[in-house]
Interface confidence: low
């Protein structure tokens, strides 16, 4: 068969790997792109091939399994390379064929430097542990299908360079790190390097994950308008500008989708025919609390304008919330000569 | 091909400050780690501290409070300020590239040396 | 902190001779051991990295083996210009950036 559907360049998988450490790397196709899975290709008489395209060149050329200590190898779909060199990197292609069918796809390779300390430019996972919530784990990620369940890898912890030994309330235990009770101060990057031994060489994995300390749903409320309030009264004359803002406080909660917006007379401002802007901004706390403003801006207010109702509502998993701003026409001053007068009875 | 050189030793008194450098021919310096070690006459190697360009500078415990390591990229260039100096600071100061990521961290190459001498 | 204690701390050997020294860590390091070579006045020498690889240019006649604590340098027929200072040094501990030497071997001319 000539032709071969190609899925292109997968750039939704940039794959990251540490330069000196193994990485197993399995072919996207079966996992995002067929319907069916190696086994079943296999079956059916297909065969995957690997080739690559070298960083900042064009011609694709095969990947080279005759290298000394079988350092790169093929294991069903899954490439494997015992271990990384920094010139690995480029973009990878896994084709699956017959006389009657084929399929491919590219994905990028990144092979990364770390340094004594781990920095390096690899994207970091983040987890999140709730403040002083008890017990929590984090497990050493990525390490599955590296080494036999026979073989016992020897794992060591850190948290940024440090190794993790007599902390008050972090313990390493094994693939997991167990955080006693979490504070702000747990906040930062921890690694785990885990040694293990294959074919009397001794390889190492180190992976890096950021943990946030986030608050507790154990204190989370409903969001908290704190303005507009009943304290604060927007009086304008016509002509000036009206300016409200909408303030919210939302507590952090994990996968909450934190919303705030403006009705007026009940409607959307974009149904309102008057010229209204809105602007947000958003800040965090250290515990990841959010507080949103959003500021509702008429230029040029008219007394009509001046008669609306203007609430802000807000909502998160935790519920939702509304507070109608207090917005006035400014009485003009007296004049003396004609209205004070004319006030005390005088003809 | 890659060389380093260090410039700036020189009899110093006690409490005094110096400022080592360290230029990098070749390839930008911001491809690698680079490390200060020192050698006191006699006596064995010491890592003094150790660079990562964009992204971090560790020091032995003993230096942290006295000696800053920095770069200038734009000139490939390495320092090491060293302020109140004393008489056990007396050695060879070296640069040195390490092996940035590898699990060896091995030192491939090394500068002269450069002597720094504190005494009154 | 990984401890690296070297042994013999100097030894005399003449051209010719099979000459081994041994680099002991006070916790395992796997295979992440260099050696390095210093003559009197001049920079340490990179002679073996990850405990038993030459870099380009070494003479095959240096060669390292060992792994976890116990590391050898082994020089197969010594060479006139081979009598120097000998240090290991470890870098395996990557939450310590304290690269470990080890006190130094002197070989001397019997």
């Known amino acids: 068969s000539e032709r071969c559907d190609d899925w292109g360049l997968d750039t939704m998988r940039q794959i990251q790997v540490f330069e000196d450490e193994p990485a197993r790397i399995k072919c996207p196709l079966f996992e995002h792109f067929l319907k069916f899975n190696y086994s079943t290709a296999h079956s059916a008489g297909l065969t995957l091939i690997w080739y690559w395209t070298r960083q900042d060149r064009d011609l694709e050329e095969p990947i080279n399994f005759r290298l000394p200590e079988n350092r790169i190898s093929k294991e069903k779909d899954v490439l494997w390379f015992r271990p990384t060199l920094l010139n690995d990197t480029g973009n990878y292609t896994c084709m699956l064929r017959n006389t009657t069918y084929c399929s491919k796809v590219a994905f990028p390779l990144e092979v990364v430097q770390k340094d004594s300390c781990f920095n390096s430019p690899m994207k970091l996972p983040v987890h999140k542990l709730y403040i002083e919530y008890g017990i929590q784990r984090i497990t050493c990620p990525n390490v599955d299908g590296y080494f036999p369940s026979s073989v016992k890898p020897t794992i060591t912890w850190y948290m940024g360079c440090y190794k993790i030994q007599n902390f008050n309330n972090v313990i390493p235990e094994g693939m997991n790190l167990s955080f006693l009770i979490a504070f702000i101060s747990n906040n930062g990057n921890y690694t785990c390097v885990v040694t293990y031994p294959e074919n009397g060489r001794t390889f190492h994995l180190t992976r890096t994950l950021t943990v946030k300390v986030v608050g507790s749903p154990k204190n989370a409320v409903p969001p908290v308008i704190h303005s507009p309030n009943d304290h604060v009264v927007y009086e304008k004359e016509p002509g000036e500008e009206l300016l409200i803002p909408c303030t919210v406080y939302f507590s952090f909660l994990m996968d909450s989708r934190n919303e705030v917006w403006w009705t007026i007379d009940g409607k959307k401002p974009d149904d309102i025919p008057i010229d209204v802007t809105i602007n947000e901004s958003i800040s965090h706390s250290r515990t990841e609390d959010e507080t949103r403003t959003q500021i509702l801006s008429i230029k040029k207010v008219t007394s009509e304008d001046l008669k609306r109702s203007y609430v802000c509502h807000a909502r998160s998993a935790k519920g939702e919330v509304a507070k109608a701003a207090t917005v006035k026409q400014k009485v003009p001053a007296p004049r003396y000569t004609v209205e004070l007068a004319c006030g005390f009875g005088a003809t | 091909e890659v060389q380093l050189v260090e410039s700036g030793g020189a009899l110093v008194q006690p409490g005094g400050s110096l400022r080592l450098s360290c230029i990098v021919s070749g390839p930008s310096l911001s491809h690698f780690d680079i490390t200060w070690f020192r050698q006191a006459p006699g006596k064995g190697l010491e890592w003094v501290a150790t660079i990562s360009p964009g992204v971090s500078t560790y020091y032995a415990s003993w230096a942290k409070s006295r000696f800053t390591i920095s770069t200038d990229t734009s000139k490939n260039t390495l320092f090491l300020q060293m302020d109140s100096l004393r008489a056990e600071d007396t050695a060879v100061y070296y640069c040195a590239r390490g092996g940035v990521g590898s699990s060896w961290k091995a030192f491939d190459l090394w500068g002269p040396g450069t002597l720094v001498t504190v005494s009154s | 902190d990984i401890v690296m204690t070297q042994s013999p701390s100097s030894l005399s050997a003449s051209v010719g001779d099979r000459v081994t020294i041994t680099c002991q860590a006070s916790e395992s390091i796997s295979t992440a051991l260099a050696w390095y070579q210093q003559k009197p006045g001049k920079a340490p020498k990179l002679l073996i990295y990850?405990?038993?690889t030459l870099p380009s240019g070494v003479p095959s006649r240096f060669s390292g083996s060992g792994s976890g604590t116990d590391f050898t340098l082994t020089i197969s027929s010594l060479q006139p210009e081979d009598f120097a200072t000998y240090y290991c040094?470890?870098?395996?501990?990557?939450?310590?950036?304290?690269?470990?030497f080890g006190g130094g071997t002197k070989v001397v001319i019997k």
């Open positions: 990850k405990a038993s």
């Open positions: 040094q470890q870098g395996f501990s990557s939450g310590n950036v304290h690269n470990a």
